[in-house]
Interface confidence: low
């Protein structure tokens, strides 16, 4: 017979990232004596909630319960009964609901309260739903890919754990990229910022870190989408919307109740002669990346450089991590090699977009509909956003790493919100360090 | 309270140019559809065309010989009329309001208006 | 483009009575998703830009005296001046703003008997 390990004692912590598209729910375990060392906490599961983002739940509040059952359930199982009371479970509602509170704190403070009386009911020791800021969402996917990386780590490691990690002890940029906004997160090189909104100070294990965050509100993949059909239809001559970022031969009616319901159209919304327009795709890259150019306002500047819309943007510093719809988006693409290059992401584009609609649901036959339509459109859009929004080059491409785990765990800020929330991320670095850290990366 | 200042008035010949300003305060300006409407002594109100985040639009009589921009640095809205001629004398005002960006609420902020007289 | 056509051109009525102004259409500008009529009444006095009184046919903007009414669905409309007083002397404009290219009515003098 085998020698038993001792059982370790484990703990766990449950973070649900109420997002604009849908809700995800991540268990993590870490062993209890090192929970203050760098890369010992790892996601054992992701639950993704069937159904849309919570804020879609405002006129169904009702319906919330339900909806969260599921997932809620799940991490009943995953998680030892005998550990249910001391689990913390944290739910954090991102640019969603920043936009629904924008037209009615009240009715997102009613989805909220649905919400947290719903996870109240689980065995868990939950701590309370939130609309974290767009700061916090970029600070905390920093976090998390640096923590993952061992950034944090006083030690050099011999090996490599991830084929991007350097060993040394630069930290990665983050680039996160959701349905309603898209962040951006990195240590300048120089460490005096034009824009004290967009700085944050950090002391993690010892170290100081002047970190520099942007989060756009309505330039996440869907909201960005909605605001170029907003302005590509004021100026359509009737209910026939051509549009270059969809295949030739895609069509899809959109209501222009649906296209005015969010506040990211606003800015475009005028009065249309019709309730319904149609989509026609004709496929075409270059035209969809120029009229994806057009939603990035670069004529006004207050400061030495800006990305768009007279945002402070720091020169480029350093590598990223490009992850969540970066990272889904161009993995489907088959863009996520190191080995390729931006001309050739820009020429694989164009190729992938002018194909015919229905020579692309037969090729990818088991992807929804609605999802598959929208490729053309996004892979666009965040090579738009990368090298006009933020100014990256066909040299600095290099230093962008499309990043979906880590080690197991889900590049995001979900990690890094339990790491804070939970006191796991010391100020100072720990006195000892044990020999076995890196067993538990 | 925004505020829409126009510069002042302007004496052309025939087949020249003339470029109105219209300076916006105490508002975002890039959230300011504005709109320019022209009345010739006597008569009734013209709409010429507007701008809004960066798109131009023109009424079709004007097509081609009216440009509209924005200056978002300095919060101005320009109107150039090219190919005069004298019946292009007339007030020309800036509004805050209407083009393409629906103006919901109509033209609700008005500049002074600028005098342009067209004479050889 | 809509035709606005305005009557009569010109009105004299004496102080304290009722004043009305017709404006119509050549189609409809009520929007049908949200309710709303985009229609806009405007008041110019001589040498002075023109000033909003009235949009959404029937909504008072800001600081416009309760005097001044608008009503009207589609493609008919009336601007409605309950008591006219002295400062009420001017040229009344409707415009629509439903479609382009935005258009103006001819005008409405509207002057003391």
């Known amino acids: 017979t085998q020698n038993k390990a001792l059982p370790e004692n484990i703990k766990y912590g449950i973070v649900l990232d109420a997002g604009s598209s849908h809700t995800s729910l991540y268990i993590y375990k870490w062993p209890a004596e090192k929970e203050n060392d760098t890369g010992v906490v790892h996601q054992v599961e992701e639950c993704r909630v069937k159904g849309p983002g919570i804020s879609k739940y405002v006129q169904k509040v009702n319906e919330i319960g339900i909806y969260l059952t599921d997932c809620m359930e799940r991490a009943r199982e995953v998680i030892p009964r005998s550990q249910h009371q001391e689990t913390p479970v944290y739910l954090g509602a991102t640019a969603g609901m920043r936009l629904l509170r924008m037209e009615s704190e009240e009715l997102a403070d009613r989805v909220l309260d649905v919400v947290e009386r719903s996870l109240s009911n689980y065995p868990f020791d939950f701590q309370g739903a939130r609309i974290i800021t767009g700061q916090e969402e970029g600070a905390y996917g920093w976090i998390t890919i640096n923590y993952l990386l061992g950034k944090f780590s006083q030690k050099t490691r011999w090996f490599s754990i991830v084929p991007y990690e350097t060993n040394n002890q630069e930290t990665f940029g983050a680039l996160d990229l959701g349905g309603a906004s898209t962040q951006i997160t990195f240590v300048p090189q120089n460490q005096t910022t034009e824009s004290p909104d967009n700085a944050l100070q950090f002391r993690l294990y010892g170290k100081d870190y002047n970190v520099y965050t942007h989060s756009f509100l309505c330039y996440g993949k869907d909201q960005a989408l909605w605001q170029k059909l907003a302005k590509d239809i004021q100026v359509a001559s009737n209910e026939i919307l051509r549009d270059p970022c969809f295949h030739p031969g895609y069509k899809k009616v959109v209501n222009v109740s649906d296209l005015y319901k969010t506040p990211c159209t606003k800015r475009f919304e005028m009065t249309l002669p019709f309730q319904q327009f149609e989509i026609q795709g004709i496929g075409n890259y270059q035209q969809c990346h120029q009229s994806v150019l057009e939603l990035f306002n670069t004529s006004y500047c207050p400061y030495s450089q800006c990305a768009f819309n007279g945002i402070f943007l720091p020169p480029l510093q350093g590598d990223f991590g490009a992850f969540s719809a970066f990272y889904f988006v161009m993995n489907f693409l088959n863009l996520t090699s190191e080995k390729v290059s931006q001309e050739k992401v820009t020429e694989m584009m164009k190729k992938f977009c002018s194909q015919p609609w229905e020579e692309i649901k037969t090729s990818y036959a088991g992807v929804k509909e609605k999802y598959l339509s929208e490729y053309c459109f996004s892979g666009t859009y965040i090579l738009s956003l990368l090298l006009q929004g933020y100014h990256f080059t066909a040299d600095s491409w290099e230093h962008i790493h499309f990043i979906g785990k880590i080690q197991g765990s889900d590049a995001g800020w979900t990690l890094g919100y339990m790491l804070n929330l939970t006191n796991m991320i010391p100020a100072e670095q720990p006195l000892s360090t044990p020999l076995s850290h890196s067993t538990y990366v | 309270q925004v505020q829409l200042v126009q510069s002042g008035a302007e004496v052309k010949k025939p087949g020249s140019s003339v470029k109105v300003s219209c300076k916006a305060s105490?508002?975002?300006?890039?959230?300011?559809?504005i709109s320019w409407v022209r009345q010739a002594p006597g008569q009734g109100l013209e709409w010429m065309g507007g701008?809004?985040?960066?798109?131009?639009n023109y009424a079709q009589k004007f097509q081609g010989r009216v440009t509209i921009t924005a200056d978002e640095s300095t919060s101005t809205a320009y109107m150039e009329l090219s190919s005069l001629r004298s019946e292009d004398t007339a007030v020309y005002y800036c509004?805050?309001?209407?083009?393409?960006?629906?103006?919901?609420?109509?033209?609700?902020?008005w500049g002074q208006g600028t005098t342009v007289t067209v004479s050889s | 483009g809509i035709v606005m056509t305005q009557s009569p051109d010109s009105l004299a009525v004496s102080l304290g009575e009722r004043a009305t102004i017709n404006c119509k259409s050549s189609q409809s500008v009520l929007f049908s998703s949200n309710n709303k009529n985009y229609l806009a009444w405007y008041q110019q006095k001589p040498g002075q830009p023109p000033k909003l009184l009235i949009y959404?046919?029937?909504t008072r903007a800001s600081g416009v005296p309760d005097r001044f009414s608008g009503s009207g669905s589609g493609t008919d409309f009336t601007l409605t001046i309950s008591s006219l007083q002295a400062e009420d002397v001017a040229v009344y404009y409707c415009q629509q703003y439903y479609l382009y290219p935005l258009t103006f009515g001819g005008g409405t003098k509207v002057e003391i008997k």
């Open positions: 105490g508002g975002t300006f890039s959230s300011l559809p």
């Open positions: 509004a805050r309001g209407g083009a393409k960006y629906a103006g919901r609420y109509g033209m609700d902020v």
């Open positions: 701008i809004g985040f960066g798109t131009a």
């Open positions: 959404w046919a029937s």
